[in-house]
């Protein structure tokens, strides 16, 4: 899992998260999101 460290006063970890679209609807394929500081963003 990729993590990136920012050169600031504190660390913010980014992590790519992958979900299957059919788990949340009728589409197929994958949905890729990014978790930043524990919050998943699109």
């Amino acid at each position: 899992d990729a993590e990136f460290r920012h050169d600031s006063g504190y660390e913010v970890h980014h992590q790519k998260l992958v979900f299957f679209a059919e788990d949340v609807g009728s589409n197929k394929g994958a949905i890729i999101g990014l978790m930043v500081g524990g919050v998943v963003i699109a």
Partner: nanobody, 124 residues
Framework: EVQLLESGGGLVQPGGSLRLSCAAS????????MGWFRQAPGKGREFVAA????????YYADSVKGRFTISRDNSKNTVYLQMNSLRPEDTAVYYC?????????????????WGQGTLVTVSS
């Protein structure tokens, strides 16, 4: 939860192929997205590939895309990993895991059940 048992590992030459199988016991197999991870000596467990509950959707790590194919047969409660064009860096213990729907399929923490692993060695 499901119980998982991997098979099909072994020694193969670079450029060769292997097919791993993961047999699941339990009636709830098609409630789970299924994934393969691998762990090389001295390294962490890394995501390889995953297949959705229906088998319609798949996702691969960049390192295996175009070489590995994941599939499942829900009538046999089995997941497969077809590995072609194998490289020495593919040497690892390969683990099958089950992740409940709606969880991220590329991270280890989403997987609630694991098999015991099967060793794949790629060497001439």
């Amino acid at each position: 939860e499901v119980q998982l048992l991997e098979s099909g590992g072994g020694l193969v030459q670079p450029g060769g192929s292997l097919r791993l199988s993961c047999a699941a016991s339990g009636r709830t197999f098609n409630n789970y997205n299924m994934g393969w991870f691998r762990q090389a000596p001295g390294k962490g467990r890394e995501f390889v590939a995953a297949v959705s509950r229906s088998g319609v959707s798949t996702y691969y790590a960049d390192s295996v895309k175009g070489r590995f194919t994941i599939s499942r047969d829900n009538s046999k409660n089995t997941v497969y990993l077809q590995m072609n064009s194998l490289r020495p860096e593919d040497t690892a213990v390969y683990y099958c895991g089950a992740a409940y729907r709606g969880t991220a399929i590329n991270v280890r923490r989403s997987y609630s059940s694991w098999g015991q692993g099967t060793l794949v060695t790629v060497s001439s």
